[in-house]
């Protein structure tokens, strides 16, 4: 771990390279309220008209070390009869997230921030835009 | 910014609190290629059978300071005729993301990592699990 010397005075913030050397506390990661996370149903992936599977993406040099990524099960959507509907497409909803990557050429607990595009779930889309009446 | 003294030797990793003091380079945050961003079609939110809107969540003490959050437009899904289908529900797909929060009581560029649950898009679910045949 990179243990940063604690100084009684904040170092100079004017320097040009400050973004390259910020101090981060990774300890308080579990600050998500339990109410919020328990509201998040885990069965949407099966019940959706555009169901998806999840794969476990591991990277020991990344924080978080594990990210679950969605892949749509079918190219089409599943209709009320459980059949694939060839007029509707199942598409992946992606989100750009921040991750911290270990900088291996430096000390073991020096990180850089990276953006990562991950699949979160799938939605069913038509080939034409329509609005509810 | 907290400018961490660059030492020719990595500091001692034995201490118990190393997760509270890691060094992070935020400089490469804007390095995601425009290609990656453009791979993410923005019209799914209108074309989906469970359409959604996006709202801008801003926090100047957070990194990233702007996060776009999804909200489902309807409680039900939109059918092929553009009508709301009362047998199908439009539900929010949420993801836990990592954000950096400024620790105001410390130096201006000292951060802590927090988890945040954000809505990414919506999907259409039935009340029973069914599989494509």
């Amino acid at each position: 771990a990179v243990l940063i010397p604690q100084s009684s005075v904040c170092p100079n913030a004017e320097a040009n390279n400050f973004l390259q050397n910020v101090k981060v506390n990774l300890k308080v990661i579990n600050s998500l309220s339990s109410k919020a996370s328990s509201r998040r149903p885990s069965d949407y992936l099966n019940r959706s008209t555009s169901p998806w599977t999840l794969s476990r993406n591991e990277d020991p040099d990344r924080y978080p070390s594990v990210i679950w990524e969605a892949q749509c099960r079918h190219q089409r959507c599943v209709n009320a009869e459980g059949k694939l509907d060839h007029h509707m497409n199942s598409v992946l909803i992606q989100q750009e997230i921040l991750v911290l990557k270990r900088e291996p050429e430096k000390c073991p607990f020096t990180f850089r921030v990276e953006k990562m595009l991950v699949g979160v779930g799938c939605t069913c889309v038509s080939s034409i835009v329509r609005h509810a009446s | 910014a907290v400018l961490i003294p660059q030492s020719s030797v990595c500091p001692n990793a034995e201490a118990n609190n190393f997760l509270q003091n890691v060094k992070v380079n935020l400089k490469v945050i804007n390095s995601l290629s425009s290609k990656a961003s453009s791979r993410r079609p923005s019209d799914y939110l209108n074309r989906s059978t469970s359409p959604w809107t996006l709202s801008r969540n801003e926090d100047p003490d957070r990194y990233p300071s702007v996060i776009w959050e999804a909200q489902c437009r309807h409680q039900r899904c939109v059918n092929a005729e553009g009508k709301l289908d009362h047998h199908m529900n439009s539900v929010l797909i949420q993801q836990e993301i990592l954000v950096l929060k400024r620790e105001p009581e410390k130096c201006p560029f000292t951060f802590r990592v927090e988890k945040m649950l954000v809505g990414v898009g919506c999907t259409c679910v039935s009340s029973i699990v069914r599989h494509a045949s």
Partner: antibody, heavy 119, light 107 residues
Framework: QVQLQQSGAELVRPGASVKLSCKAS????????IHWVKQTPVHGLAWIGV????????AYNQKFKDKATLTADKSSSTAYMELSSLTSEDSAVYYC????????????WGQGTTLTVSS | SIVMTQTPKFLLVSAGDRVTITCKAS??????VAWYQHKPGQSPKLLIN???NRYTGVPDRFTGSGYGTDFTFTISTVQAEDLAIYFC?????????FGGGTKLEIK
Amino acid sequence: QVQLQQSGAELVRPGASVKLSCKASGYTFSDYEIHWVKQTPVHGLAWIGVIHPGNGGTAYNQKFKDKATLTADKSSSTAYMELSSLTSEDSAVYYCERFLTYEGYFDYWGQGTTLTVSS
Amino acid sequence: SIVMTQTPKFLLVSAGDRVTITCKASQSVNNDVAWYQHKPGQSPKLLINYASNRYTGVPDRFTGSGYGTDFTFTISTVQAEDLAIYFCQQDYGSPYTFGGGTKLEIK
């Protein structure tokens, strides 16, 4: 405090199935992965697989893919592992453990469930 | 998968002795190694994570070190209550693998 309470010892016949449970308390169940591990005197400890109760995702060690099925019930904060087509080779102590996906390590284990497969 | 070779299998020591256990990984696992204590009839307890980080509440007589493939776990002054099986685990990647364990017995 965090606890993983596993179900009691099981004695089952060859060919049958069994469902072991791991009840979590002291934390938000859907925030952490639950992993399962098999322990035998001959082979030691072997990782079986993982379930993330928050999103329903599962991943398995290839060696156990056809043997174990992992599920979780958020309403009771309980993870389950079903073992099918049991043989004497499945006789073992089975542990559940909690994994922190951000930090990347296991911090708490259950006390273990002893499974004996015998006719 | 990564093989974790732990030595020795057994240790017979007196209270006050210094004990060293080693784990060798078949490939580099950075510092993603944990050490556990397993007492009869109890759940295994995490003592060390990230190879050298003493887990919350663990007495300072327990220490760990190493990086890459070679890891060491030390009890500086063994006490009677340290009677247990100690094992290492790599959390570098799945399938997560374990050392064979070291049974510590007190004379």
